[in-house]
């Protein structure tokens, strides 16, 4: 039975040209995290594997940095980076947990961070 929940940074905004940290946290389960995948819509950005460490997709190497922790840092943001991001936790013995973050990249300098929220 899957008892865990994923807490994410929720809806966030950032300035064009700046950087942002995408963070997810899996709680309420004793399952072991074997891998975390980060995706933008249907594109795989990065993988953090418990055995192998980080793998960044070649097309994102210049603008994506691993961490902190199991999070992901997006750099040199453009308006095209606006959209949904997903953290996918592969765990044993539970299975697959998914968290969602919506990022809005703003032209102006008035980028405010959204509140944290829970995803079951």
């Amino acid at each position: 039975m899957m008892t865990g929940t994923i807490e994410t940074t929720g809806n966030i905004s950032a300035e064009k040209g700046g950087s942002i940290i995408l963070q997810c946290h899996l709680s309420s389960t004793t399952a072991q995290v074997t891998q975390v995948n980060w995706e933008q819509q249907d594109q795989l950005l990065a993988i953090c594997n418990a055995d192998l460490g980080w793998h960044i997709s070649p097309s994102f190497k210049d603008r994506v940095a691993p961490g902190p922790g199991l999070g992901l840092t997006l750099q040199s943001l453009t308006v095209n980076d606006t959209g949904e991001y997903f953290c996918i936790y592969h765990t044993y013995p539970d299975g697959t947990y998914t968290g969602r973050i919506f990022l809005e990249v703003l032209e102006s300098s008035v980028a405010e961070h959204g509140a944290r929220f829970q995803i079951p």
Partner: antibody, heavy 119, light 107 residues
């Protein structure tokens, strides 16, 4: 070209043991989660066991826990399945499979090795 | 364990037909569904993963859709090479389970 070649299957007596091997080539074996999937005579597919790239994590189907052991030798590019206390319901074609790096599905399968448990 | 129910269990179709196979999960599996094709005497081959992502080298006549509990595999125009058995598999919760298969036969 990715290649997975299973061996070690055969006819075994009820309660007996067998060790299956899977020789992998054409990819960086140590980077991939691997598993064993079996297909019963009724053509039903079951994920029997899986092992993470470095061998730190293993999964077993409940019905084989304590009887089967999955292991890997990354230096030899080989996956193993040690089976003991075999039951008639273990009769199946056993496939060695590779998982996508994303772990979303099994993208390569071997040709299979047949295991028949008889009384 | 999550039960995966495929329908129909078999179907007869002609070359050029549009074929639809459905897979229903006994509980929510998000988009964690894969489709495999198996020909007699051969190993299964990955067609689609994450419900709708086409695996490498798979012809575009194959497509997948759905999320939650209901999923569909569609072959837009059946080719001679497509007569086979198709299986769905969920990757949401252990044990990762397969459907019983759908055999596509020549009419």
């Amino acid at each position: 070209d990715v290649k997975l070649v299973e061996s070690g299957g055969g006819l075994v007596k009820l309660g007996g043991s067998l060790k299956l091997s899977c020789a992998a080539s054409g990819f960086t074996f140590s980077s991939y989660t691997m598993s064993w999937v079996r297909q019963t005579p009724e053509k039903r597919l079951e994920l029997v066991a899986a092992i993470s790239s470095g061998g730190s994590y293993t999964y077993y189907l409940d019905t084989v826990k304590g009887r089967f052991t999955i292991s890997r030798d990354n230096a030899k590019n080989t996956l193993y399945l040690q089976m003991s206390s075999l039951k008639s319901e273990d009769t199946a074609l056993f496939y060695c499979t590779r998982w996508l790096l994303s772990l979303y599905a099994m993208d390569y399968w071997g040709q299979g090795t047949s295991v028949t448990v008889s009384s | 364990a999550i039960q995966m129910t495929q329908s129909p269990s078999s179907l007869s179709a002609s070359v050029g037909d549009r074929v639809t196979i459905t897979c229903q999960a006994s509980q929510n599996i998000n988009v964690w569904l894969s489709w495999y094709q198996q020909k007699p005497g051969k190993a299964p081959k990955l067609l689609i993963y994450k419900a709708s992502t086409l695996a490498s080298g798979v012809p575009s006549r194959f497509s997948g859709s759905g999320s939650g509990t209901d999923f569909t595999l569609t072959i837009s125009s059946l080719q001679p090479d497509d007569f086979a058995t198709y299986y769905c598999q969920q990757g949401q919760t252990y044990p990762f389970t397969f459907g019983g298969g759908t055999k596509v036969e020549i009419k």
